[in-house]
Amino acid sequence: HKSSSQGQDRHMIRMRQLIDIVDQLKNYVNDLVPEFLPAPEDVETNCEWSAFSCFQKAQLKSANTGNNERIINVSIKKLKRKPPSTNAGRRQKHRLTCPSCDSYEKKPPKEFLERFKSLLQKMIHQHLSSRTHGSEDS
């Protein structure tokens, strides 16, 4: 059983790790299927976890063209690691009013990854801010 602060620290580590995974995939953008994918941007408050799940559901795929296939597939799979439902559910009070994944603008892999990174950075910033202000609801 993790203490609350330990759990929060691990949560932050996981979120930062996702940014590193996105950065790694950006190195291999030419080895990804050039498909257009829903890429949330300027996500409204309280819809961050909904947008996060849209990024995770997107069919980012290796083009299977070369020697980087293994690291790409491993990285994509790690990007789809599901956070515990308490993280997403507890914080997503207004998730029923959030846009559907299909309603977001579709972008090629490079922009998709940039927008995913931007959302992750925003979520980390919010999490740190809420901790600073002593709020549970990060």
Epitope: R14, Q17, D20, I71, R81
Partner: antibody
Framework: QVQLVESGGGVVQPGRSLRLSCAAS????????MHWVRQAPGKGLEWVAF????????YYADSVKGRFTISRDNSKNTLYLQMNSLRAEDTAVYYC???????????????????WGQGTTVTVSS | EIVLTQSPGTLSLSPGERATLSCRAS???????LAWYQQKPGQAPRLLIY???SRASGIPDRFSGSGSGTDFTLTISRLEPEDFAVYYC???????FGQGTKVEIK
């Protein structure tokens, strides 16, 4: 304590088969991906294969693809490496290693192989 | 496939000296994906550094890692007798190892 113990090594003729096992203890085996890594006599480390924590994905080095199969039995906390069509160049010490990135969101998060067995020796010779 | 090139092949130093080991990647590597291992004769490798600069559990603070992109460094600030061994860098995800650097007693 956290431990990995390999077994199944030995001397085998070229073209024959061998199955290695790796018994895990001291941690939740089903939460971790697992690797096989080998080291030929006097040489460096060579990654051989990886299996996802739930067995859903497997990856192999080009040198063993089509000949070796990695598998796991989470109910027995055991990792396996089935080696077919063995060649002289497969002669090595074979290590199993735990992938340090747990499937648990709040678990270990190391991008590296953080626990290793002591190794089992495979010699392919006629 | 990415290639990791370690240099020098062998480093001859005395206890108490500083050791600097290099690992160069043929393509850019995200820092999270770079690990270092130590292997002593007759023993299994041991994870020293993950994420390019984070020490694994139980690793003394004389070991440090740095670098980004294609150039990474493992530094042993003051060599102890037990540090003489072979060191490998590795890219996580492709799990490619460098060829190793042997740190031997001068």
């Amino acid at each position: 304590q956290v431990q990995l113990v390999e077994s199944g090594g030995g001397v085998v003729q070229p073209g024959r088969s061998l199955r290695l096992s790796c018994a895990a203890s001291g941690f939740t085996f089903s939460s971790y991906g697992m690797h096989w890594v080998r080291q030929a006599p006097g040489k460096g480390l060579e990654w051989v294969a990886f299996i996802w924590y739930d067995g859903s994905d497997k990856y192999y080095a080009d040198s063993v693809k089509g000949r070796f199969t990695i598998s796991r039995d989470n109910s027995k906390n055991t990792l396996y490496l089935q080696m077919n069509s063995l060649r002289a160049e497969d002669t090595a010490v074979y290590y199993c290693a735990r992938d340090g990135d747990s499937s648990d969101w709040y678990g270990d998060y190391y991008f590296g192989m953080d626990v290793w067995g002591q190794g089992t020796t495979v010699t392919v010779s006629s | 496939e990415i290639v990791l090139t370690q240099s020098p092949g062998t480093l001859s130093l005395s206890p108490g000296e500083r050791a600097t080991l290099s690992c160069r990647a043929s393509q850019s590597v995200s820092s999270s994906y770079l690990a270092w291992y130590q292997q002593k004769p007759g023993q299994a490798p041991r994870l020293l550094i993950y994420g390019a600069s984070s020490r694994a559990s139980g690793i003394p603070d004389r070991f440090s890692g740095s670098g980004s992109g294609t150039d990474f460094t493992l530094t042993i600030s003051r060599l102890e007798p037990e540090d003489f061994a072979v060191y490998y860098c590795q890219q996580y995800g492709s799990w490619t190892f460098g060829q190793g650097t042997k740190v031997e007693i001068k």
